[in-house]
Each structure stands twice: as structure tokens, then as C-alpha cells.
Amino acid sequence: QEEDLPRPSISAEPGTVIPLGSHVTFVCRGPVGVQTFRLERDSRSTYNDTEDVSQASPSESEARFRIDSVREGNAGLYRCIYYKPPKWSEQSDYLELLVKESSGGPDSPDTEPGSSAGPTQRPSDNSHNEHAPASQGLKAEHLY
């Protein structure tokens, strides 16, 4: 019997409000045995894959996606999915990345702590299931 794949989670370090030119790392988490994590931008039109997966906890694995120098164009909605043979998971909730002008003044607000949710629930979409990463049919326009 094929197991039910839990939905992944997504968070951002150091937070979801990032000054222009600073770095941000998206962290995707899923169960043990994930082969590929994918970070999707907006509505699956662009994505990045990684097989560089690490052991996050006894029950979880994770992957990290870093943007070295955030631009205004990086603002938007991000979510994770993963491939655990033989199928893809559902998507995580969306996480919204906000890019702010770097004022540099003493009153600059702190970046928000990383969030593993996001106010927006994504619609159910199981179209990834049963497809290996290479046969996804999506255009791998890189996110950064």
C-alpha cells in the first residue's frame, strides 16, 4: 500500500521581510526519504530543484534555497513540494517574501521571524503525483 505523503512546510531565514540586497534562505521540510525538494514561485511557473537534502530531525528531512542578494523582483509567493519515490507530494502553504528598501537608519524595522505557514491556503493540486522530477513538464526558469 502506497503511503500518504505529508505536506511539506516552508520557512524563510532570517525572515520574510528582507532588505534589498540582503540574503534570504528558504527552508523546505518533509518526511524521511525525500529525494528532491522543489521551491516554486507563484503559480508553479518557475521553480528550483535540489537533491542536496539533509537530515533535519528523526522524522524530517530538509533542503535550503538561498538567494544571495535579494532584488525587488524576488518579492512574491513561494511554496515547496517534494519527490519521494514514486510520487510527488502536495504543495506547502504559500510563504510571501516582502522586499523593503534598505533605509539603513536606526528606526528600520527588524526582519520578521521565519514563518512556516502563510495566510494563504493553496488549492488542492495532486497533479505532481506519479511523475519523476525529470518528467515534470514545467519550465525550470530559475528563481534567482
Epitope: 528550483n48 535540489t50 537533491e51 537534502v53 539533509s54 537530515q55 538561498r66
Partner: antibody
């Protein structure tokens, strides 16, 4: 088809240096963690080093037996993995395998290159 | 470091036999265990990851089980082409460590 081709092995004197290379093809090199694993003649397998991808800041990890002497590196533009080996000892004699890893297990292996440390 | 104790170090069996190899970790590795097959003069081949997950193209006579510190690798019906050395490996924490290997021979 995944291909990993090691080169650079050979005979070297104790205390000497050698640099191994691994040319990778058939997969997206820059999104994968990569490893070196070695096997002394007639012995078992020993993990040597790991390098993560750019998204994980190219973090490196080493076995205690080689730490401070060996350096793992990668050139994503050339799809090539390296192992710089300094202060070589006779116990470093082994076949060195370049490996494409998953989350710490070793999914695809090269054919290996023999390093012999002897005077 | 996590020590992996693999047994037996060698075994002899007949074609069609059920063969079992065990691997014991010195601490819990949370099913981060792989099994490899190595034939003489060749590179190892990954058979199983995450303790039980069979790699694509690996015959179904191979299987893995276990959790915590104790793991088992089984060949349900030994075939002549299965003659090789088998290794377990933990990847819960670095340094990643291998068992000492089990050399499998045909009786």
C-alpha cells in the same frame, strides 16, 4: 545516464600531495551534494568528504582521518568535483570513488582511481 | 562517531536459500540506513535506502527492514549473480560510517 569519471590518481611518496578530479555528466551537478569515498586494498568502504551545493553555502565535511590534510571542492561551471590531498600517508593508499549523493547515502559511483602512497 | 557492526563477516549459502545479514548501530539512526552490493573490481551499487526503500531496478528478492539500532538485509532466494560483498551504511550523522561488510559465497 549519470557518469562520474575520476582522474588524478597515481603513485606518490609519503608527505606528498595529489589532486583528484571527477568529471560529472548526465545530471544537474550544481543541485547535488557530492562525496568522496575510499577503499583500501582488500578492505571495506570509508567515507572521506562531502560538499554541499551552493544553496547550502558549499558546506564541507570530513572524516577525522583526513581532516586538515584533504580539501574537497567543486566547480559548478565545469561540472567537476575535486579532492586536494596533502601530507599523504601510507594508510591513504586506496581506490578513491567520486559519488553523487542523496541525503547522505551514495546513489551513483564513479569507477574509482587508485592512489598509492609509498616510498 | 556511530559504529556499525555488521554480521556475519562472511557466509556461504546455496542457490535458492534465504540469506539474512544484520547491521547494528551504536545509537539510534532513525532508519537512515543504506545497503550496497559490491562485486570484485567494481564500484559499489546502492540497493536500499531509508532502511526499506528498494532502488529502481533492484530485484524484489532483496529487501530491508529494521528501525532504531537494529537492521536486517534479506535475499529471499539466492541467485548466482548475488555473489558479492554487502555493506550497510548509516547517514543519520557525519561522519557517515559503513559496516565491515559481509562476503557472500555460493556453497
Amino acid at each position: 545516464e549519470v557518469q562520474l569519471v575520476e582522474s588524478g590518481g597515481g603513485l606518490v611518496q609519503p608527505g606528498g600531495s595529489l589532486k583528484l578530479s571527477c568529471a560529472a555528466s548526465g545530471f544537474t551537478f550544481n543541485t547535488n551534494a557530492m562525496y568522496w569515498v575510499r577503499q583500501a586494498p582488500g578492505k571495506g568502504l570509508e567515507w572521506v568528504a562531502r560538499i554541499r551545493s551552493k544553496s547550502s553555502n558549499y558546506a564541507t565535511y570530513y572524516a577525522a582521518s583526513v581532516k586538515g590534510r584533504f580539501t574537497i571542492s567543486r566547480d559548478d561551471s565545469k561540472n567537476t568535483l575535486y579532492l586536494q590531498m596533502n601530507s599523504l600517508k601510507t594508510e591513504d593508499t586506496a581506490v578513491y570513488y567520486c559519488v553523487r549523493g542523496g541525503s547522505g547515502f551514495f546513489a551513483y559511483w564513479g569507477q574509482g582511481t587508485l592512489v598509492t602512497v609509498s616510498s | 562517531d556511530i559504529q556499525m557492526t555488521q554480521s556475519p563477516s562472511s557466509l556461504s549459502a546455496s542457490v535458492g536459500d534465504r540469506v539474512t545479514i544484520t547491521c547494528k548501530a551504536s545509537e539510534d539512526i532513525y532508519i537512515r540506513l543504506a545497503w550496497y552490493q559490491q562485486k570484485p573490481g567494481k564500484a559499489p551499487r546502492l540497493l536500499i535506502s531509508t532502511a526499506t526503500s528498494l532502488e529502481t531496478g533492484v530485484p524484489s528478492r532483496f529487501s530491508g527492514s529494521g528501525s532504531g539500532t537494529d537492521y536486517t538485509f534479506t535475499i529471499s532466494s539466492l541467485q548466482p549473480e548475488d555473489i558479492a560483498t554487502y555493506y550497510c551504511q548509516q547517514y543519520w550523522s557525519t561522519p557517515y560510517t559503513f559496516g565491515g561488510g559481509t562476503r557472500l559465497e555460493i556453497k
